[in-house]
Interface confidence: medium
């Protein structure tokens, strides 16, 4: 009869490397008498015999993991005990090896030139995969702008047009290589004018072609503005080549004008625009630009810079010794006075005052200022600034001038031309057109003038919701 013998593990457990979804086996050979009871643990937690992920055979001496998962990584121990002497244990590690896998692949990106682009590429694998990138058919080189981050993502600072193209990321370790799908990086470029229209000094009745070339991604559209309004006459020819749009405006010249080329393209929900302007003057008129009443020129001041159209010509009244300076001082004084008025009134009053003091100008033989349309003036007076205007007129009757709008060089609305009689004879106030769409409730208005002074305009979908109604469309 055999003598009892304490268990001895004759084959200690070793580190096992296994690929995901493959079989991994630990062998724990034991010599003892009587036969031992062998149990297994993973990370010190007992593996249950009925766990279907494992197979325990050869009296418990073989542990097989039937389909290795990433989470099976850990320390596996076999413990043998037969009641003779103490239990014995041997442990070994399971290292789950994994071919590279791209868990967050890159996606198509549209980015504006000059911004930062990040193409994601998150990977899994053991050993940890190294990530590189391919652009087109070539490996992408890192430089001061282009870097592969620790996460595997590709970061491009100050994106340039030449960065556009097809990219894929490559994850590589000793077990294999994984490639992402090809993704497209599209670089959008703000509209930019390459060739501005040139100014011309021509004889009355000449034909002039103004040319404007712009570039951008997407290709911009070009529109033309004449003295602040859409071009009413002339023919436009356009051609597009290599993302460059070339627009030619042919004009028959019967009056001088300021022509602005506006290039626009769209980036998502936003638009980018670029402008360039040219003047067309009539040769004989240059001498009489500064006539006895005034002259037309660009506004060089500060106060009305944000209110007046950027390239518009405005009228300077030569009854002042230094018209530019005198009118700027007037508006500056008025501006300070407006600090006392309500937030509803102030921007409307600013638009009214700037366009009244610096009236849009047609530089004809006799430079002609274009007054504000009566309807806009009345809208400011009776709607946006109703309280302030009434207070001002009340003070005027009592001879009190203390605050608010009393110092302001305001026009007399009733003397202004109506836009309904001749829309080209007066100036609109774009601020009011915009604002009226956004105002739903208005102060109640008691007109300080007889109602006959206020034009009864036809109803319109965009009329002011106020009595009397002013139509400004």
């Amino acid at each position: 009869e055999k003598l009892p013998k304490a268990p001895v593990i004759t084959t200690p457990l070793e580190t096992v490397d296994a690929l995901v979804e493959e079989v991994a086996t630990f062998m724990c050979a034991v010599e003892s008498y009587p036969q031992p009871e062998i149990s297994w643990t993973r990370n010190k937690i007992l593996i249950k015999l009925f766990d279907t992920r494992y197979s325990i055979r050869e009296n418990g001496q073989l542990l097989t993991i039937l389909s290795v998962e990433d989470s099976d990584d850990g320390i596996y121990c076999c413990i043998a005990n037969n009641g003779v002497g103490g239990a014995v244990e041997s442990c070994g590690a399971l290292q789950v090896k994994m071919k590279p896998k791209i868990t967050r692949p890159p996606i198509n990106v549209k980015i504006i030139e000059g911004l930062k682009a990040v193409l994601p590429c998150t990977t899994m694998g053991n050993p940890k995969p190294s990530v590189s990138w391919i652009k087109g058919d070539n490996a992408l080189r890192e430089n001061s702008r282009i870097a592969v981050l620790e996460s595997g993502s590709l970061r491009i600072h100050n994106v340039q047009k030449e960065d556009a193209g097809q990219y894929r990321c490559v994850a590589k370790n000793s077990l294999g290589t994984a490639y992402s799908k090809l993704v497209k990086l599209e670089v959008e470029v703000f509209a930019r004018i390459l060739r501005a229209p040139e100014s011309h000094n021509v004889t009355f009745g000449s034909f002039v072609t103004l040319r404007c070339t712009a570039i951008g991604i997407p290709v911009p559209t070009i529109s033309w503005i004449e003295n602040g309004n859409a071009v009413s006459s002339g023919s436009i020819q356009e051609s597009v080549k290599d993302r460059v749009i070339d627009s030619r405006l042919q004009l028959f010249i019967t009056k001088p004008g300021l022509y602005t080329c506006i290039a626009t393209n769209k980036h998502g929900e936003k638009f980018s625009t670029a402008k360039a302007a040219a003047t067309v003057s009539i040769a004989e008129w240059s001498k009489s630009q500064k006539d006895s009443q005034g002259y037309c020129a660009q506004y060089r001041g500060e106060v009305c810079d944000a209110v007046l159209a950027k390239d518009a010509l405005v009228f300077f009244n030569t009854s002042y010794r230094d018209p530019e300076d005198a009118q700027e001082l007037l508006i500056h004084t008025a501006w300070n006075e407006l600090k006392a008025v309500s937030p509803l009134c102030r921007p409307a009053a600013e638009a009214l005052l700037c366009n009244h003091l610096f009236q849009e100008c047609s530089p004809g033989v006799v430079p002609t200022p274009m007054p504000i349309c009566r309807e806009y003036c009345l809208a400011v007076k009776e709607l946006f600034c109703a309280k302030e205007w009434q207070a001002m007129e009340g003070k005027a009757h009592r001879g009190l001038y203390r605050s608010g709008m009393h110092l302001l060089p305001v026009p007399e609305c009733s003397k202004l031309p109506s836009m309904h009689r001749d829309p080209t004879a007066c100036t609109r106030l774009p601020y009011l057109d915009y604002k009226k769409e956004n105002i739903t409730t208005f102060p109640s208005i008691t007109s300080s003038r007889p109602s006959a002074d206020i034009p009864n305009l036809p109803a319109s979908t965009s009329s002011f919701a106020v009595s009397p109604a002013y139509s400004m469309t």
Partner: antibody, heavy 121, light 112 residues
Framework: EVQLLESGGGLVQPGGSLRLSCAAS????????MSWVRQAPGKGLEWVSA????????YYKESVKGRFTISRDNSKNTLYLQMNSLRAEDTAVYYC??????????????WGQGTLVTVSS | QTVVTQEPSFSVSPGGTVTLTCGLS?????????PDWYQQTPGQAPRTLIY???SRHSGVPDRFSGSILGNKAALTITGAQADDESDYYC????????????FGGGTKLTVL
């Protein structure tokens, strides 16, 4: 008599900073726009920056934008030009000039004698 | 970018008349450019002669006049004198995206 006296010029290394001052007298300083104009040795005049009477806006030549700052202290009748990240091409005599009126771009009707700024390592 | 062009040099006989011009590399000079003219003698600060096309600065002799000739600004000196020998600069207000003021390269006038 209108007088404009610049100071603060000197030798500075590339990347360095200088602050120019212009003390004005003989006119109501707060009623006029002011400008800085420079002239590189043997070269022509070059407008650098402008500021209106109120100081509410500032204007710069493209090549100095973000590096130079014009300002004014109407209570001290003084115009300033803070110059940072100086480059060799900024070497010039810097003139302080008075504008003919309140606006920043009126004619330059009075000039200082200038202060020399040399940017060199 | 606005480039203002001037004749690099010009000569005139004493008592003669000379017209210096100031143009734009692209386009015409108009009164909206508010052309100004300055005179500078070597080692001196500039001096204002003409502002806003044709307005003479105080103390400037009426021998100096400004105008727009065709598509350029012009400074005309009639009855030229020896001490008119100087550099002449024109300055233009320009609005191309942002406001600025641009000087021409200057004209060296010699009175022979």
């Amino acid at each position: 008599e209108v007088q404009l006296l610049e100071s603060g010029g000197g030798l500075v290394q590339p990347g360095g900073s200088l602050r120019l001052s212009c003390a004005a007298s003989g006119f109501t300083f707060s009623d006029y726009g002011m400008s800085w104009v420079r002239q590189a040795p043997g070269k022509g005049l070059e407008w650098v920056s402008a500021i209106p009477w109120s100081g509410g806006s500032t204007y710069y030549k493209e090549s100095v934008k973000g590096r130079f700052t014009i300002s004014r202290d109407n209570s001290k009748n003084t115009l300033y030009l803070q110059m940072n990240s100086l480059r060799a091409e900024d070497t010039a005599v810097y003139y302080c000039a008075k504008r003919s009126g309140r606006i920043a771009f009126g004619a330059l009707d009075a000039w200082g004698q200038g202060t020399l700024v040399t940017v060199s390592s | 970018q606005t480039v203002v062009t001037q004749e690099p040099s010009f000569s005139v006989s004493p008592g003669g008349t000379v017209t210096l011009t100031c143009g734009l590399s692209s386009g015409s000079v108009t009164s909206s450019n508010y052309p100004d003219w300055y005179q500078q003698t070597p080692g001196q600060a500039p001096r204002t002669l003409i502002y806003s096309t044709d307005s003479r600065h105080s103390g400037v002799p009426d021998r100096f006049s400004g105008s727009i000739l065709g598509n350029k600004a012009a400074l005309t000196i009639t009855g030229a004198q020896a001490d008119d020998e100087s550099d002449y600069y024109c300055g233009l207000y320009s609005y191309s995206g942002s406001k600025n003021y641009v000087f021409g390269g200057g004209t060296k006038l010699t009175v022979l």
